[in-house]
Each structure stands twice: as structure tokens, then as C-alpha cells.
Interface confidence: low
């Protein structure tokens, strides 16, 4: 399978773009929008009936460095009642973002973008198959 | 995660905080297949909070498509196939980091940007005010 | 596709531990949960233990404080140490876990899979 590249040739490229080198790209780590804040509903991984955890992952060489990561806390979906009904399934819903790596080759650093599947939440779906009869 | 020793006869000029602008690989690093949330899982009708996915298309960006959950009910879907009021559908939101073209139309100059993306909803008791 | 094989069961003394292991094998990617249900004869199924890939853990009432439950994440195995086994312990015990594999070229983010069950007998 082929690594996506994210350049595209169907660009016209203007008189003001910056040099790159062939095979690179520049990329400015400002973020834009790094001020904004999300505005979920409160304490939803506990109220729902698919609850989740969270996880944070840490890694110096990675930007940004802290990644979090939901992890769900039943198989099944809570009731009504407060209890794990596992005829339902709580199931995890992912998502992609980009991040840099920086690599150490010798005594040179480089940058390489990466996707990184998140997951984000949990939903209670019904399921599709059970196995025990 | 762990952070690669250096060889000790390298000069000692490494800043820990990440430089403003670099240069990267032209190539994206990654195990994950970029999918179509469509195809690659049914939850979205599956779910008692179900929802609907919306394409959103920028030229700009990388990745220039990016699918939106927008949740199909207020309530949630009961055992009988019907919409329970008594329980709130609610999106799950994420921030994300994609590529903006900057300058515009550059090919191989971007920006970092965060964004807001509604991934998928969830079911959830609903917070109940009551007023005095 | 994904088999999940228990072993581990049998008949044991009231008082006295057991250890059940479960190992999930097939096109794997990641497991998010995975853990132990119990069913007793004439009685609804219900949750033993479970773990999630990052350690997180949780246990039925009946079982707090004398059972205990880990994984290998490395080994797809989680292992559940039951002390202190009483009467009321006895059911088939199913092993369940919640993971992401690859089929036929398609990735499913997350399903929930069952083993066939291992036989716990405990007599007094």
C-alpha cells in the first residue's frame, strides 16, 4: 500500500510560495486556533450509557506531546436501572489526527507527519453477531 | 514515550521544545487506513444515538475531507425501536490538527491548524435543572 | 476473524482459588476490553471482571476484594485469579473482549466476541 503524500500537482503554484526542497515540505507548528476550547456536554464519558475512561499519553518526541486517549469502561451499555446490559455493546468511536515525530539519526534530527488514530468516546450499538448460542 | 539517546559526540545545540517551522517528509507515516467512516463501520445506524455523516470539503486543507456526526434524534433509540425523550443524544467532539495551505495554494507549505470535528454521538442521562 | 479459548476450569474446593486464562487469537489489531462473565444454571449472565488494554478495571459486586484480573497485552491473554471461591461461584464462566481485527481486507474498529465457556464447579 502506498504512503499518501500530501502535496498536490493540481495546485497552481504563485510567484510567493516558499522555496522547499524536493521530497519536503514546510511546516509551520503555530497552530492556528490553539486558543479554542471544546464545549461538550458536561461529564458526558460518565453519564452515558457507554461510559469511558480517559488516558493520557505522553511522548517528548511527538507534537503535540500529549495525546488523549478514551478507553470504554464495559462490554455491554448501562440500563435504566444502573446495571451492564450485554446484549448491548459499548464500542469505541476512533478518529485520525496528524502529528510530527521527531526522528534521531545520528547526530541529525528530522520530522515526519504521522496519523494517529484517536479514540474519542463510546456508543452503545446493538450487536451483530453473538457467538454464544 | 521514549526519546532516542543521541550519540555523545553530537554537539549539544538539541532545544527539547520543538522548532517554529520544519521541514517534513513529503510522506505521512501511518498503520491506519484513512476510511470512509461509512465503509469502514456501521455504528452510526447501529447506535442508540444515531447518526448522520456529513462530507465537508476543503481544497485548502489536508486532509481535504473530513466527515461530520450530526445526531439524528434528541432523544435515544429504546428496545423497541422507538425515540426515549427521557435520555439525550449528544455528539462526541474531538480536536484535531490538519494542514492548512499557507500561503493559499501553495503545494508544499502548510500551517498547522486545530479543528473541531463531531465524531460520532453517544446516549447520555440528561442533566436535569430544575427551576426554583 | 477472532477465537477467544478459555481454559483453566474444573472443580474446586470451597475456600480454595483457581485460575482462569483466556487467549484471543486471529486477525487482531487492538483490544480495547476484555474480561469474564459468568451464567449459573437458571440465572441471568453476569459481569465477572473486566480489564481494558490500558490496565483500567471492573468488577461484579459478588467478586470485589477476592477476585482479580490482568492482562498480557502482548500475549492477546487476560488471566482472572479467583480466591477465596464460595458455592455461589459455581457457572460457566465466558470469556468476552472487545476487539478491532481485520476481515476480508475491511477493518472493524471494535466488535464484542465470546468464547464457549469453561465450566467452574465449586463444592463445599
Known amino acids: 500500500r502506498k504512503i499518501p503524500k500530501v502535496g498536490h500537482t493540481f495546485f497552481q503554484k504563485p510567484e510567493s510560495c516558499p522555496p522547499v526542497p524536493g521530497g519536503s515540505m514546510k511546516l509551520d507548528i503555530g497552530i492556528i486556533n490553539e486558543n479554542q476550547r471544546v464545549s461538550m456536554s458536561r461529564n458526558i464519558e460518565s453519564r452515558s450509557t457507554s461510559p469511558w475512561n480517559y488516558t493520557v499519553t505522553w511522548d517528548p518526541n511527538r507534537y503535540p506531546s500529549e495525546v488523549v486517549q478514551a478507553q470504554c469502561r464495559n462490554l455491554g451499555c448501562i440500563n435504566a436501572q444502573g446495571k451492564e446490559d450485554i446484549s448491548m455493546n459499548s464500542v469505541p468511536i476512533q478518529q485520525e489526527t496528524l502529528v510530527v515525530r521527531r526522528k534521531h539519526q545520528g547526530c541529525s534530527v528530522s520530522f515526519q507527519l504521522e496519523k494517529v488514530l484517536v479514540t474519542v468516546g463510546c456508543t452503545c450499538v446493538t450487536p451483530v453477531i453473538h457467538h454464544v448460542q | 514515550g521514549i526519546t532516542i539517546p543521541r550519540n555523545p559526540g553530537c554537539p549539544n545545540s538539541e532545544d527539547k521544545n520543538f522548532p517554529r517551522t520544519v521541514m517534513v517528509n513529503l510522506n505521512i507515516h501511518n498503520r491506519n487506513t484513512n476510511t470512509n467512516p461509512k465503509r469502514s463501520s456501521d455504528y452510526y445506524n447501529r447506535s442508540t444515538s444515531p447518526w448522520n455523516l456529513h462530507r465537508n470539503e476543503d481544497p485548502e486543507r489536508y486532509p481535504s475531507v473530513i466527515w461530520e456526526a450530526k445526531c439524528r434524534h434528541l432523544g435515544c433509540i429504546n428496545a423497541d425501536g422507538n425515540v426515549d425523550y427521557h435520555m439525550n443524544s449528544v455528539p462526541i467532539q474531538q480536536e484535531i490538527l490538519v494542514l492548512r495551505r499557507e500561503p493559499p495554494h501553495c503545494p508544499n507549505s502548510f500551517r498547522l491548524e486545530k479543528i473541531l470535528v463531531s465524531v460520532g454521538c453517544t446516549c447520555v442521562t440528561p442533566i436535569v435543572h430544575h427551576v426554583a | 476473524e477472532v477465537q477467544l479459548v478459555e481454559s483453566g476450569g474444573g472443580l474446586v474446593q470451597a475456600g480454595g482459588s483457581q485460575s482462569l486464562s483466556c487467549v484471543a487469537s486471529g486477525t487482531i489489531v487492538n483490544i480495547n476490553v476484555m474480561g469474564w462473565y459468568r451464567q449459573a444454571p437458571g440465572k441471568q449472565r453476569e459481569l465477572v471482571a473486566l480489564?481494558?488494554?490500558?490496565?483500567?478495571?471492573t468488577y461484579g459486586d459478588s467478586v470485589k476484594g477476592r477476585f482479580t484480573i490482568s492482562i498480557d497485552n502482548a500475549k492477546n491473554t487476560v488471566i482472572l485469579q479467583m480466591n477465596s471461591l464460595e458455592a455461589e461461584d459455581t457457572a460457566v464462566y465466558y470469556c468476552a473482549a472487545e476487539i478491532g481485527y481485520y476481515s476480508g481486507g475491511t477493518y472493524f474498529s471494535s466488535e464484542a466476541h465470546w468464547g464457549q465457556g469453561t465450566q467452574v464447579t465449586v463444592s463445599s
Open positions: 480489564i481494558t488494554s490500558g490496565g483500567g478495571t
